[in-house]
Amino acid sequence: AESCTSRPHITVVEGEPFYLKHCSCSLAHEIETTTKSWYKSSGSQEHVELNPRSSSRIALHDCVLEFWPVELNDTGSYFFQMKNYTQKWKLNVIRRNKHSCFTERQVTSKIVEVKKFFQITCENSYYQTLVNSTSLYKNCKKLLLENNKNPTIKKNAEFEDQGYYSCVHFLHHNGKLFNITKTFNITIVEDRSNIVPVLLGPKLNHVAVELGKNVRLNCSALLNEEDVIYWMFGEENGSDPNIHEEKEMRIMTPEGKWHASKVLRIENIGESNLNVLYNCTVASTGGTDTKSFILVRKADMADIPGHVFTR
């Protein structure tokens, strides 16, 4: 079943079939027995009840108000009323562009990355049974595709695919021919793939310290805007009042990525701060990477190879 019309503000193009479907439609048992009314108000007119006699272009079916077709003077507010249920829409009918196969104000824009999967399918489920044929146009030139019921493009995007794609459905109703147009503005952009965030420096760092002094552990990374950099230490971060995570610093690189730096400040170093892991983690949509710092008493430095130290 076609979804109900939940958007309160709707813009449509003159000369096309159009419908409003209220959202209490599935209460079918109530619908049979309950009085239902559709109203329109516009400008000076207040709440005029609609029925097929109002206009030869209007049809009412159960849950739906149909226009065959919608015209500029259909602009206004529409109401559906059933018992204590009311639904309201504001309809704005705009002029068709007579010099193009589509109207610019009724275009859906999509951005597709080059080499990524790109798909356009021409479907219209509500009018499906009435559609005789459907054509797909690119920049108003008809594309020759096998399926003339639901023309489809499925491919990996190339820059040449950029353009305006219009699905035009042709249908008959009461002996008249109508068409419905849906247009997509497809923009093909460079691959915007995220970089794999990189933690700078060695994965394991032994830092020589003196008891009672302070130390600043600097964790730096090259990352994407969404990526997170944080410190993990002890059972529960924040349990040691002498440990402070400083505000993260970020600088944008010329390539549009970020150089981030986050310092962990340990004041008045005590025995409990020695020989434990202080982990700095960068997390991205691709996963995590971690580097570790271990504080070692200066007197114990001789036991550890020189190349693992940071000062």
């Epitope: 794999v196 997170v228 950099i229 997390a283 691709g286 996963g287 971690t290």
Partner: antibody
Framework: QVQLVQSGAEVKKPGASVKVSCKAS????????ISWVRQAPGQGLEWMGW????????NYAQKVQGRVTMTTDTSTNTAYMELRSLRSDDTAVYYC????????WGRGTLVTVSS | DIVMTQSPDSLAVSLGERATINCKSS????????????LAWYQQKPGQPPKLLIY???TRESGVPDRFSGSGSGTDFTLTISSLQAEDVAVYYC?????????FGQGTKLEIK
């Protein structure tokens, strides 16, 4: 078509191990981490852990730490989740999901642990 | 670990009416460096995997109807369905991806009144 295809249902005895696979197609496998999420019958979603496809780094939830191993094979774009020492409360549908907000899910693999 | 708590556990709303689901995190999931909230919303129907609706707390996933919207920041978040349709009957989950272990709310079952 961008998708994650999981291996079929498994029935295991308590104490046994199970290894579920998740094959990715039509996207750059190493760009996204793979999370494993399980759902016991009639229950909510439980995050088990994830693996970075680009470097193999893992993070496991405390509840399954020590019993779970997550791996990837970048040559086949496949992620694996092995759960050992199975118990009856491990009976669940196991899903793999992409990224850190999960915009792509496998269909799920039902693992039944029963004696 | 960050604990996510949803309210209510279940909800019955009339067709065409507004449905609101709340989610509270035990600590902030707002990252000050980029001002993003690391929170997502999912919809799950019986026998199906969850489906992503909203990420970064308020960004609608492509293809998700615009009646679904997300709001909130820090620790308090809301998923709103502006005009409930029959096909929206499902269980809805929030999830934080700010810190591992990533965690879900317990779920909210949405039904038609």
């Amino acid at each position: 078509q961008v998708q994650l295809v999981q291996s079929g249902a498994e029935v295991k005895k308590p104490g046994a191990s199970v290894k579920v696979s998740c094959k990715a197609s039509d996207y750059t496998f190493t760009t996204y981490g793979i999370s494993w999420v399980r759902q016991a019958p009639g229950q909510g979603l439980e995050w088990m852990g994830w693996i970075s496809a680009y470097n193999g780094n893992t993070n496991y939830a405390q509840k399954v730490q020590g019993r779970v191993t997550m791996t990837t094979d970048t040559s086949t774009n496949t992620a694996y989740m092995e759960l050992r020492s199975l118990r009856s409360d491990d009976t669940a549908v196991y899903y793999c999901a992409r990224g850190w907000y999960f915009d792509l899910w496998g269909r799920g693999t039902l693992v039944t642990v029963s004696s | 670990d960050i604990v996510m708590t949803q309210s209510p556990d279940s909800l019955a709303v009339s067709l065409g009416e507004r449905a609101t689901i709340n989610c509270k995190s035990s600590q902030s999931v707002l990252y000050s460096s980029n001002n993003k909230n690391y929170l997502a919303w999912y919809q799950q129907k019986p026998g199906q995997p969850p489906k992503l609706l909203i990420y970064w707390a308020s960004t609608r996933e492509s293809g998700v109807p615009d009646r679904f919207s997300g709001s909130g920041s820090g620790t308090d978040f809301t998923l709103t369905i502006s005009s409930l349709q029959a096909e929206d009957v499902a269980v809805y989950y929030c999830q934080q991806y700010y810190r591992t272990p990533y965690s879900f709310g317990q779920g909210t079952k949405l039904e038609i009144k």
